[in-house]
Interface confidence: low
């Protein structure tokens, strides 16, 4: 409408007793420059006088009359486009409507702005994303509909009352569109943060508490599991029994299915929280874990390494390489399945024990003819001594020696 003055400013401004209010404002008059400006508090039009009645907070006229409020209220505008105002300090009874009475040479206008002043600092508002999942970075936002150049504030994040280590980014807006202070915190919640309290605390420049907002974190996560085994060290002998129990320490949402895995493969018909293994055999050795699923996904317990112990089985000897040429190197390896691994080996050369040879491997860097023959071994662990296997033959090839003429 070409018959109207054009104003831009926030519709409502918020503050509290003792703070200040900064009112960003622009305008465009219908004609010419501004000649008179009056700031009213709760103005009312008087039909009899054809003028506005109300408390005059600020007055700028040709004759230069200045109300007592003039020190507290400042008009920071100009004669043609800026109508920014500042009230410092602002009081509870400033709440209501502010009326900007503008007069040019031929035109008049009353622009109204709402001012909401509370008795105490009002709380900020924490905004969370609709869903929070463990280990997925989210941005927590704390918004306060307040900012004023004369009254510095800060927003601090707390988790369970302790300042959060992550760096927050604080931004302020003092524009004709919006006035606010905002703090954004990037945060990768862990499952253990579920149910914890996050606080955004409004503080003054000295760090003094003014107000706060709190939220309880709802962190969606896969089931968190604990596996318990009897016996606790998961070391048994063949024929013993083993019991494994799966406990859910946390799940959000609730769990739906349970299963057991051995060496990464699902065990059939094992869908309860207890796994009973009776009269175990050595092939049941392996890594066991339980898996419990919810709508987020499957959770796995730590692995339990079940060791089914048994005495060494009959040994075999592997020779690398036979036949061997004199001066070449040879390695003997004593092979025997056992749990725990053999701690001691006894080596035999042509049926005679090789003194001091107690390791799994015997390495001969330089073979001589006297090394030829049958090599066998016996493996020993804490459960017993294995049997000596058939052994392996080392053939040593060498050139003629001590040639005599007959």
């Amino acid at each position: 409408d070409s018959s109207k003055w054009v104003f831009e400013h926030p519709e409502t401004l918020y503050a509290w007793e003792g703070a200040c209010v900064w009112i960003p404002c622009t305008y465009r008059a219908l004609d010419g420059d501004l000649e008179s400006f009056i700031l009213f508090h709760n103005p009312e039009y008087n039909k009899n006088t054809s003028k506005f009645d109300g408390t005059r907070l600020y007055e700028s006229t040709k004759d230069g009359k200045v109300p007592s409020e003039q020190k507290r209220v400042q008009f920071l505008g100009d004669k043609n486009k800026n109508c920014t105002l500042s009230i410092h300090p602002v009081h509870l009874n400033d709440s209501g409507q502010l009326g900007l009475r503008m007069e040019s040479k031929t035109e008049k206008w009353m622009e109204r702005i709402h001012l909401n002043v509370s008795e105490r600092p009002f709380p900020p508002h924490i905004q969370l994303p609709p869903e929070i999942q463990e280990s997925q970075e989210v941005t927590l936002t704390c918004l306060l509909n307040f900012s004023c150049y004369g009254y510095p504030i800060q927003l601090q994040w707390l988790l369970e009352g302790v300042p959060m280590r992550q760096a927050a980014v604080t931004s302020t807006s003092l524009t004709i569109k919006s006035v606010f202070t905002r703090s954004e915190l990037k945060f990768s919640p862990q499952w253990s943060h579920h149910g914890k309290i996050v606080t955004c605390q409004l503080q003054d420049a000295d760090g003094k508490f003014l107000s706060n907002d709190t939220v309880q974190l709802n962190v969606k996560h896969t089931p968190k599991l604990e596996i318990k085994v009897t016996p606790s060290d998961a070391i048994v002998r063949e024929g013993d029994s083993v019991t494994m129990t799966c406990e859910v320490s946390s799940s959000n949402p609730e769990y739906t299915t349970v299963s057991w895995l051995k060496d990464g493969t699902s065990l059939k018909k094992q869908n309860t929280f207890t796994l009973n293994l009776r009269e175990v055999t050595k092939d049941q050795s392996g890594k066991y874990c339980c898996q419990v699923s919810n709508d987020v996904g499957p959770g796995r317990s730590e692995e339990v390494f079940l060791q089914v112990q048994y005495a060494p089985e009959p040994s075999t000897v592997q020779i690398l390489h036979s036949p061997a040429v004199e001066g070449s190197q040879v390695e003997f390896l004593c092979m025997s399945l056992a749990n725990p691994l053999p701690t001691n080996y006894t080596w035999y050369h042509n049926g005679k024990e090789m003194q001091g040879r107690t390791e799994e491997k015997v390495h001969i860097p330089k073979i001589l003819p006297w090394h030829a023959g049958t090599y066998s071994c016996v493996a020993e662990n804490i459960l017993g001594t294995g049997q000596r296997g058939p052994g392996a033959e080392l053939d040593v090839q060498y050139p003629p020696k001590k040639v005599t003429t007959v």
């Epitope: 003194q355 001091g356 390791e359 491997k361 015997v362 390495h363 001969i364 860097p365 330089k366």
Partner: nanobody
Framework: QVQLVESGGGLVQAGGSLRLSCAAS????????IGWFRQAPGKEREGVSC????????YYADSVKGRFTISRDNAKNTVYLQMNSLRPEDTAVYHC???????????????WGQGTQVTVSS
């Protein structure tokens, strides 16, 4: 009776050198193995180097190849181990040993000396 007496150990900075000596006596055979093994506290003994008396052929553990050299002086019945570019992980008691065979794990456990301490500081 075979007797082996080691000397030459000591404290040296990383990158430095030492020369160990082993004086052997009482060995009657011409065909035997003599060499060095080492043992660090709490660790398995580890063969370092071995030499056959018959042809002077030498063998080294992978960890010392190119840095250590075994040699002998027949006239003095002495075997030497020249250790260059020493590293902190070379710190151990070094024993001289003699026996019928050279093994990766050392010379065999027939005869060995009291040892000499080598400490390499970083």
């Amino acid at each position: 009776q075979v007797q082996l007496v080691e000397s030459g150990g000591g404290l040296v900075q990383a990158g430095g050198s030492l020369r160990l000596s082993c004086a052997a006596s009482g060995i009657t055979s011409d065909d035997y193995a003599i060499g060095w093994f080492r043992q660090a506290p709490g660790k398995e003994r580890e063969g370092v180097s071995c030499m056959y008396s018959s042809d002077g052929s030498t063998y080294y553990a992978d960890s010392v190849k190119g840095r250590f050299t075994i040699s002998r002086d027949n006239a003095k019945n002495t075997v030497y181990l020249q250790m260059n570019s020493l590293r902190p992980e070379d710190t151990a008691v070094y024993h001289c040993a003699a026996g019928p065979w050279c093994f990766v794990t050392g010379v065999g456990r027939e005869e060995w000396g009291q040892g000499t301490q080598v400490t390499v500081s970083s």
